[in-house]
């Protein structure tokens, strides 16, 4: 059914709209779903309706439950439903999942943080901002009407972000609180079809019988945070893993970010004591992102000793 | 009584124009959104184009995106939808229908619908 | 774009009889849907609205149930008037959409 979640803290107020919208011009009915009683429209009443909203001033966990409103036009009449979950106040600093707001993103251009569900409530500036429970203090921190702006935004400012403020309703004041995470994101972040830059597609990798030999697979998937981005080495078309070889493993190695913001990955291929029969299988570096697979294959050539031969004139 | 009578539809060539207009009586024309909905002869019904009672927000199927106008004149409560560069595939009725919740960004049913005006694209 | 797939595609009944008609939504619609019925030569008709309420005028015999993605519409006891082809239509976003039809004909 057209249902929409709204929560809250005890002894804070809450303000829920109909999830049906209408025009201001139609009437609108609560009532309480399981005893299909009557919502009143009193004021004093401390949960009473006000056309497409619906007060709890303040909330008690007791309220929690399912409103029905039905939106009365002349011809129509829809209905919705608002399931109010009321919280216990949390004596410790962390906000439960089940209290946050929608994550924003923000970037070193756009560091707007908007307080969820401001604009149901009569407030007047300013808000109040949290971090992690910590008032925001300095001049990086500006609040700004319904939202925070931070200045030269930085990877450490992703976080939960709580403003607080006050709702006034015919003269009597109440506490209102809001949780959203922030994260940061690299603006100038893109991503590419695998690049390659190790080993070189047919590479002939000479290596010494009885000897340790390191193959490392280096590709870039583009600027910044990458998502799905891998690389990894097969053995015969078949991963290292599965191939069950012992001497034969592979080890991450650095991810690399390049001063030119290149966001690349290492897969070292470590053989110990090569032998003979290693020199039979293919190797494959694979690099798989998005945007799809690129790979480079290698094969192992046994490395000739270095020949003493004289020099005759 | 609330009616929508469709006109304007006809014989026209591929890659031709055409205009049908649609005259709504019988309710407060601007405060409604409206809607442009098609049926090719024998074939079911296709949503066209919306536009909000103001005129401000209009929206359209991908298929006519850059070729159909929708358009009103709330003054005459006249609705309208300009079709160029018109496709074989565009023949049907084409009738103009009331959205009688209107609210912003959202739609709704279609509770009254004009009888339809016929418009075929051939050579 | 949501996509509505009704079925059957054609319902052969007698007056009298109960009819069930099938709209199932490619993806979940809330109960974002109305059926509409249509005559030959003439427009169609809003019957249901919000999957289950009858829109003024519209006999208690027709009613809709369902939610999400799986719809149907009922005419309990058909009368000679209800053989035509019903259509739903979903609103719940940007475009609007109907499904193909059902037409209901005399067996």
């Known amino acids: 059914k057209f249902s929409k979640q709204s929560w809250g803290l005890e002894n804070e107020a809450l303000i829920v709209r109909c999830p049906r919208q209408g025009k201001p011009s139609y009437t609108v009915d609560w009532y309480y779903s399981q005893t299909n009683k009557s919502i009143p429209t009193q004021e004093r009443n401390r949960v009473f309706a006000s056309g497409q909203l619906l007060k709890f001033l303040p909330a008690a966990v007791a309220d929690s439950g399912i409103y029905t409103c039905i939106v009365r036009s002349p011809t129509f009449n829809r209905t919705g439903y608002a399931n109010v979950t009321i919280y216990k106040k949390q004596s410790d600093c962390n906000v439960p999942d089940y209290l946050m707001y929608s994550t924003v993103s923000g970037s070193e251009k756009n560091s707007k943080i908007y307080c969820p569900t401001i604009d149901l409530y009569n407030w007047t500036a300013p808000l109040e901002w949290f971090k992690n429970c910590q008032a925001l203090q300095g001049s990086r921190y500006r609040a700004h009407k319904s939202f925070l702006v931070i200045d030269n935004v930085m990877t450490e400012d992703a976080g939960d972000y709580t403003c607080k403020f006050i709702h006034n309703e015919n003269g009597a004041n109440y506490s209102v609180t809001a949780t959203r995470s922030f994260t940061v994101k690299d603006e100038q972040g893109f991503s590419l079809f695998p690049v390659i830059g190790a080993p070189a597609q047919n590479e002939i990798k000479e290596v010494e019988i009885g000897k340790n030999a390191n193959l490392t697979c280096s590709a870039c998937f583009g600027k910044g945070t990458q998502f799905l981005a891998a690389v990894l080495w097969q053995l015969n078309g078949t991963k290292i893993t599965d191939f069950g070889e012992p001497r034969i493993q592979q080890e991450e190695g650095q991810n690399q970010s390049f001063s030119n913001g290149l966001a690349c990955l290492d897969m070292v291929l470590r053989i110990a004591d090569v032998k003979e029969e290693d020199l039979l299988l293919q190797y494959d570096c694979l690099a798989l992102n998005l945007h799809g697979l690129r790979r480079h294959t290698v094969r192992l050539s046994r490395k000739n000793p270095i020949d003493h031969h004289s020099i005759y004139c | 009584e609330v009616q929508l009578l469709e006109s304007g539809g006809g014989l026209v060539q591929p890659g031709g124009s055409l205009r049908l207009s649609c005259a709504a009586s019988?309710?407060?024309?601007?405060?409604?959104?409206m809607f442009w909905v098609r049926q090719a002869p024998g074939k079911g019904l296709e949503w066209v184009s919306a536009?909000?009672?103001?005129?401000?927000?209009?929206y359209y199927a991908d298929s006519v995106k850059g070729r159909f106008t929708i358009s009103r004149d709330n003054s005459k409560n006249t609705l309208y939808l300009q079709m160029n560069s018109l496709r074989a595939e565009d023949t049907a009725v084409y009738y103009c229908?009331?959205?009688?919740?209107?609210?912003?960004?959202?739609?709704?049913?279609?509770?009254?619908w004009g009888q339809g005006t016929l418009v075929t694209v051939s050579s | 774009e949501i996509v509505l797939t009704q079925s059957p595609a054609t319902l052969s009944l007698s007056p009298g009889e109960r009819a069930t008609l099938s709209c199932r939504a490619s993806q979940s619609v809330d109960d974002d849907l109305a059926w509409y019925q249509q005559k030959p030569g003439q427009a169609p008709r809003l019957l249901i609205y919000?999957?289950?309420n009858r829109a003024t005028g519209i006999p208690a015999r027709f009613s809709g149930s369902g939610s999400g993605t799986d719809f149907t519409l009922t005419i309990s006891s058909l009368e000679p008037e209800d053989f035509a082809v019903y259509y739903c239509q979903q609103y719940i976003g940007a475009p609007i959409t109907f499904g193909q039809g059902t037409k209901v004909e005399i067996k």
């Open positions: 536009i909000a009672g103001e005129g401000g927000r209009t």
């Open positions: 019988g309710f407060t024309f601007s405060s409604y959104d």
């Open positions: 919000d999957a289950s």
């Open positions: 229908a009331r959205d009688p919740w209107s609210t912003e960004g959202s739609f709704f049913v279609l509770d009254y």
